[in-house]
Interface confidence: low
C-alpha cells in the first residue's frame, strides 16, 4: 500500500507521458488522476516504467473499478496485465477475441502463466465454447493449448472448431482427450472424399473405435507406422491381419521393427501365426495352429 | 421427408412367429445401418438388433439372440424382423430406426438413432 | 454387456428451471454416448450425439458433456415441452444398452 500523500505543487499529471518515469512511486501515486490512466492506457505500454512504479498503477486502477476493470481499460493493459493476480482476471469480463490477442502478445515466448490460464478460462466461459476463430488464437500462441484442457472443457468444442486444429496441437493429448475430439473431427471433416478426408482425420486416430478402422482399411489409406503407434491398443485388437495389412499398405513391413511395442505386441498375441506368416516379415507370438481361438471381440464391422 | 413405418405387430400366443417389416422413404436406405429397438409397457428402451448397410453384419441382443432374424431388402427399401418362439416377455412396442450417419465409410451405429418409426405394438399372450 | 445407470430415475421441476440429468456407464464408452427425450405414446427423438454433439433442430437449451464413464444431459431454462422422459444410450460396444431413463414432471 502506497501511503496517501498530496501532490507536489505544479507536479500533477495533465496526461500519461514520459515524463512519469521520474516520478517517485508516492508522486504516481497523488498526482496521477486514476480516471485519467484509465482513458490513456494505451500509452502505458509505450512508457519504460518499473515493476514498482506498475505496482503503483494498479493500485490505483482496482482502486477506481474494485468490481473489475472495464474491456476498454484491459485491452490496453500491456505489460501491466503481468501484475494481475488470477484472482484480478476471474473478475474480468472479456468478450473480444482482439483483448484475448493482446494480452497474449505481452505474454507470448513464455509459458502459460496461472494469469493467462484463468483469462482463457473467463473469456471461454463468457462465449459459452471454444469456436474456431478463439481456437486458431489460441493454439497460435500455445501449440499445447488443445491437449491442457480436460476432456470435460473439450465436450464444449463444437465440430466446425476442428478445422482450426493442427497435427501439432495434438502432440501432447493423451487417449481420453482424442475420445473427445474424434468424434468431432469426424463431423467436422464428414463432406470430404476419400484422401482428403484421411489426411485430416490422421492425427485424431488416437480416439478412433475399431469399426472406423476397419472402414478406412478398404480406402486405401496406406497409414504411416508412426500414426498406427498411437492408435488405441483395444481398437487394434480386433483387426484382422489382412485389415492391418490393408490399412499400412506399403508401411506394413514396418511392424517388424515395432513388433516388441504396444500395440503391435498385443496385436500380433491375438493373431493366428499362419496368418502373420502370409505378411512374411518374421513377425512371432502368434497363435499356433490347431489352437481354439475364442472371439472375445463384441463389434461387428456395420458399415 | 424421410420416414419409418412399421407394420405387422399383432397379438400373438407364445412359441408362436411374427414378422415385422419397416418401410423407409426420404433417404438412401442401402447405405445406412438400421435398427431395431423395443419398449415393453411402462418400462425402459431395449435394443434389439442392428444390420449394416450390408446384410452380412448383423447383431443382436443377448435376449433375442437364436430366436430373432433381422434382414433388409435394399431393392423394396424395407427392414424386416423375423421374431420366432415368441415369449410374454417379447410383448413391447416395436421400433425401427435408422443411424445417424455422419462421415465417410461411416461405421453409422456409433452416432445415435435419428429417425425413428411410429412402432408397431406386439402382444404374446396365450 | 455395458450396463447404464441414470440419476434421478424422476424429478420435478418448474418452467424456467436448469436441471441436470445424469448418465453413468459400468465401463469406459468413450464419448459415444447419446440423449433422447421420449413423450407418452411417442417414439424417442435424438437430442445429443457423441456426447457433446447437438442434433440438428434440438433447441441451444439442451446441452451434453462428459466422457469415460460420467455424463451429463443439461437444460439450461426448462420449456413448457420439454416435460418428457429423457434416456441415455450407450453406442461404444455391442450390444447397445439404454439407461432406464428420468422422468421430468411439472412441480
Known amino acids: 500500500e502506497v501511503e496517501k500523500t498530496a501532490c507536489p505543487s505544479g507536479k500533477k499529471a495533465r496526461e500519461i507521458d514520459e515524463s512519469l518515469i521520474f516520478y517517485k512511486k508516492w508522486e504516481l501515486e497523488a498526482c496521477v488522476d486514476a480516471a485519467l490512466l484509465a482513458t490513456q492506457m494505451d500509452r502505458v505500454n509505450a512508457i519504460p516504467f518499473t515493476y514498482e512504479q506498475l505496482d503503483v498503477l494498479k493500485h490505483k486502477l482496482d482502486e477506481l473499478y474494485p468490481q473489475g476493470y472495464p474491456e476498454s481499460v484491459i485491452q490496453h493493459l500491456g505489460y501491466l496485465f503481468l501484475k494481475m493476480s488470477p484472482e484480478d482476471i476471474r473478475k474480468w469480463n472479456v468478450t473480444s477475441l482482439e483483448t484475448l490477442k493482446a494480452l497474449l502478445e505481452v505474454n507470448k515466448g513464455h509459458e502459460m502463466s496461472p494469469q493467462v490460464a484463468t483469462l482463457i478460462d473467463r473469456f471461454v466461459k463468457g462465449r459459452g465454447q471454444l469456436d474456431k476463430d478463439t481456437l486458431d488464437t489460441l493454439t497460435a500462441f500455445y501449440p499445447g493449448y488443445l491437449c491442457s484442457l480436460s476432456p470435460e472443457e473439450l465436450s464444449s468444442v463444437p465440430p466446425s472448431s476442428i478445422w482450426a486444429v493442427r497435427p501439432q496441437d495434438l502432440d501432447t493429448c493423451d487417449p481420453r482427450q482424442l475420445d473427445v475430439l474424434y468424434p468431432k473431427a469426424r463431423l467436422a471433416f464428414q463432406n470430404m472424399n476419400g484422401s482428403e478426408y484421411f489426411v485430416k482425420i490422421q492425427s485424431f486416430l488416437g480416439g478412433a473405435p475399431t469399426e472406423d478402422l476397419k472402414a478406412l482399411s478398404q480406402q486405401n489409406v496406406s497409414m504411416d507406422l508412426a500414426t498406427f503407434m498411437k492408435l488405441r491398443t483395444d481398437a487394434v485388437l480386433p483387426l484382422t491381419v489382412a485389415e492391418v495389412q490393408k490399412l499400412l499398405g506399403p508401411h506394413v513391413e514396418g511392424l517388424k521393427a515395432e513388433e516388441r511395442h504396444r500395440p503391435v505386441r498385443d496385436w500380433i498375441l491375438r493373431q493366428r501365426q499362419d496368418d502373420l506368416d502370409t505378411l512374411g516379415l518374421g513377425l512371432q507370438g502368434g497363435i499356433p495352429n490347431g489352437y481354439l481361438v475364442l472371439d472375445l471381440s463384441m463389434q461387428e464391422a456395420l458399415s | 421427408q424421410v420416414q419409418l413405418v412399421e407394420s405387422g405387430g399383432g397379438v400373438v400366443q407364445p412359441g408362436r412367429s411374427l414378422r415385422l417389416s419397416c418401410a423407409a422413404s426420404?433417404?438412401?436406405?442401402?447405405?445406412?445401418?438400421m435398427h431395431w429397438v423395443r419398449q415393453a409397457p411402462g418400462k425402459c428402451l431395449e435394443w434389439v438388433a442392428v444390420i449394416g448397410s450390408r446384410e452380412s453384419n448383423k447383431n443382436y441382443a443377448e435376449s433375442v439372440k437364436g430366436r430373432f432374424t433381422i434382414s433388409r431388402d435394399n431393392s423394396k427399401n424395407t427392414l424386416y424382423l423375423q421374431m420366432n418362439s415368441l415369449r410374454a416377455e417379447d410383448t413391447a412396442v416395436y421400433y425401427c430406426?435408422?443411424?445417424?450417419?455422419?462421415?465417410?465409410?461411416?461405421?453409422?451405429?456409433?452416432?445415435?438413432?435419428?429417425?425413428w418409426g411410429q412402432g408397431t405394438t406386439v402382444t404374446v399372450s396365450s | 454387456e455395458i450396463q447404464m445407470t441414470q440419476s434421478p430415475s424422476s424429478l420435478s421441476a418448474s418452467v424456467g428451471d436448469r436441471v441436470t440429468i445424469t448418465c453413468r456407464a459400468s465401463?469406459?464408452?468413450?464419448?459415444?454416448l447419446n440423449w433422447y427425450q421420449q413423450k407418452p405414446g411417442k417414439a424417442p427423438k435424438l437430442l445429443i450425439f457423441t456426447a457433446s454433439s447437438l442434433q440438428s433442430g434440438v433447441p441451444s437449451r439442451f446441452s451434453g458433456s462428459g466422457s469415460g464413464t460420467d455424463f451429463t444431459l443439461t437444460i439450461s431454462s426448462l420449456q413448457p415441452e420439454d416435460f418428457a422422459t429423457y434416456y441415455c444410450?450407450?453406442?461404444?460396444?455391442?450390444?447397445?444398452?439404454f439407461g432406464c431413463g428420468t422422468r421430468l414432471e411439472i412441480k
Open positions: 426420404g433417404f438412401t436406405f442401402s447405405s445406412y445401418g
Open positions: 444410450q450407450q453406442s461404444y460396444e455391442m450390444p447397445i444398452t
Open positions: 465401463q469406459s464408452v468413450r464419448s459415444f
Open positions: 430406426a435408422s443411424a445417424l450417419r455422419i462421415a465417410v465409410a461411416a461405421s453409422y451405429y456409433y452416432y445415435g438413432l435419428d429417425v
